[in-house]
Interface confidence: low
Amino acid sequence: MAEVPELASEMMAYYSGNEDDLFFEADGPKQMKCSFQDLDLCPLDGGIQLRISDHHYSKGFRQAASVVVAMDKLRKMLVPCPQTFQENDLSTFFPFIFEEEPIFFDTWDNEAYVHDAPVRSLNCTLRDSQQKSLVMSGPYELKALHLQGQDMEQQVVFSMSFVQGEESNDKIPVALGLKEKNLYLSCVLKDDKPTLQLESVDPKNYPKKKMEKRFVFNKIEINNKLEFESAQFPNWYISTSQAENMPVFLGGTKGGQDITDFTMQFVSS
C-alpha cells in the first residue's frame, strides 16, 4: 500500500489553511457541511472533510493527505439515478472510490500519542460467504445463521476500528468491537488451542489506536471477500461452520469445510 504523498503545491491551493481542518476538494474550496469520520454521506455537491481533533497529532506527521473525492465523481458513476439514495446503495461503490491508506509516521514525540490518537471506526455487519448472519447466542458467544425479514435486526453490528499493527498491501489491522457494548473479539489460548472469544473491556479505555495484540485481526481482501486473520495467531481465521446456528470460532484451516470468507455491509451510525 502506497505511502501517503507529500502535499503538492497545487493541492495546497485547496487547503483550508487551518491546521485543525485538513480538508480538500476536487473543485476547490466550498463550504464544508459534512464529515468523513463516521462515513456519513455528504450532499451530492459537498466534499469530504477529515478533521484532526487535536494539535498534538500534527506533531511528528509527515505532511500528508489522503485522496479526497468530491461527490460529483460518485454522481457520475451512478447516473442515471434518483437525486436521493440510501447509504446502503452507496456502500457498493465505496471500495471503488476510497482505498484504506495507512498513515505512516516518521517519529512520535511521545509514545502516549499512539495510545491516545483518535481511532477511525466504522459500523458494519458481517455475513459469511453462505450469507449467514452473525448474532449473539449468549452474553459471550456469536453464532452464525440465516436470517430473513425482521429477524435481520438480531444481527450483530460491529464497530470496526482501524488500529496500529503490521500493515502490508493486502492486510489492514482492525479490532472488532460490538457496537455500543464494551465487548471485543479477542484471540487467546485455551487448552493450548487458539480460541475466539468476546472479551469485556473498560469502555473508558477502548477503542484505542494501540490495541493489545489479542484484539487485532488482519483484514485481508481477496476477490471482494474479506478474511480476518488473528494477529496473535497467524494463519488462524475467524470462521463459521457450514451448519446452521453454530458458534463463530477461530479456525486454523482455509479452503476446507469451514468458512473463512465474509462480506461487510456498512451501517449508518
Epitope: V135, M136, S137, G138, P139, Y140, L145, Q154, E180, K181, N182, S200, D202, P203, N245
Partner: antibody, heavy 118, light 107 residues
Framework: EVQLVQSGAEVKKPGESLKISCKGS????????IGWVRQMPGKGLEWMGI????????RYSPSFQGQVTISADKSISTAYLQWSSLKASDTAMYYC???????????WGQGTMVTVSS | EIVLTQSPATLSLSPGERATLSCRAS??????LAWYQQKPGQAPRLLIY???NRATGIPARFSGSGSGTDFTLTISSLEPEDFAVYYC?????????FGQGTKLEIK
Amino acid sequence: EVQLVQSGAEVKKPGESLKISCKGSGYSFTSYWIGWVRQMPGKGLEWMGIIYPSDSDTRYSPSFQGQVTISADKSISTAYLQWSSLKASDTAMYYCARYTNWDAFDIWGQGTMVTVSS
Amino acid sequence: EIVLTQSPATLSLSPGERATLSCRASQSVSSYLAWYQQKPGQAPRLLIYDASNRATGIPARFSGSGSGTDFTLTISSLEPEDFAVYYCQQRSNWMFPFGQGTKLEIK
C-alpha cells in the same frame, strides 16, 4: 403470541425429586437462552442458571451449581429445572424467562410454586 | 462477583409525583443493565434494557439512565398501577444477578 407456560404448583416432601417445565411458543425456541429465577416467599429475585436449547449449553450461578439441573428438549420447545433431593429451603416460586440479544429477560413464565414440607 | 445495590429499599410517594430509583454496581457493568417491575402475585415484567431503552409496550413515563456503576430508573409522573417492586439486573461473565429490589408504595 410469544409466551412461556410453566407447569403447575407442586407440593413435595424433603428428599423427594422434582422436575418442573417451561414450554415456549410463538418464537424460535432454539434461538434464545432460557433462564431460571428463584423467588423465595417475601424475598427478591435470584438468578439460578441459563440454557441454550439448541445445543443445551448450560451455565449456572455458583449458588445453585450442583443443587439443581437445568435441561431442555428442543423437539418439544421445553426447558426443565430439576432437583434430585428437595430441601425445605427450596420452597419458592420459580420462574423461567427468555433471555434476549439485548441482555435482558424479556418474556417470563407465570411461575411454578414449589412447596417442600414434611 | 458483581453485587447490585438498590436504594432506597422502600420509596413512599403519591400518584403524580416523580420517582427516582437507584441501582449501584460494585464494579463497572457498562450499559448491561435492565429494570423489571413486579406486582404482587405476578411475574416480573421487563421495563428497560441496556440501561436506557424502553421495552416494547412500556409507557414513556418510564426512563432509564446511567452507565458504568450508577444507574437510575425514573418514573416521571406516578400512576396508581406503578406501585410495585422494581429490580435492576445485569450480566457479567455468565452471571446475571438482580438487585435486592425497591418497593414503591403509595404514601
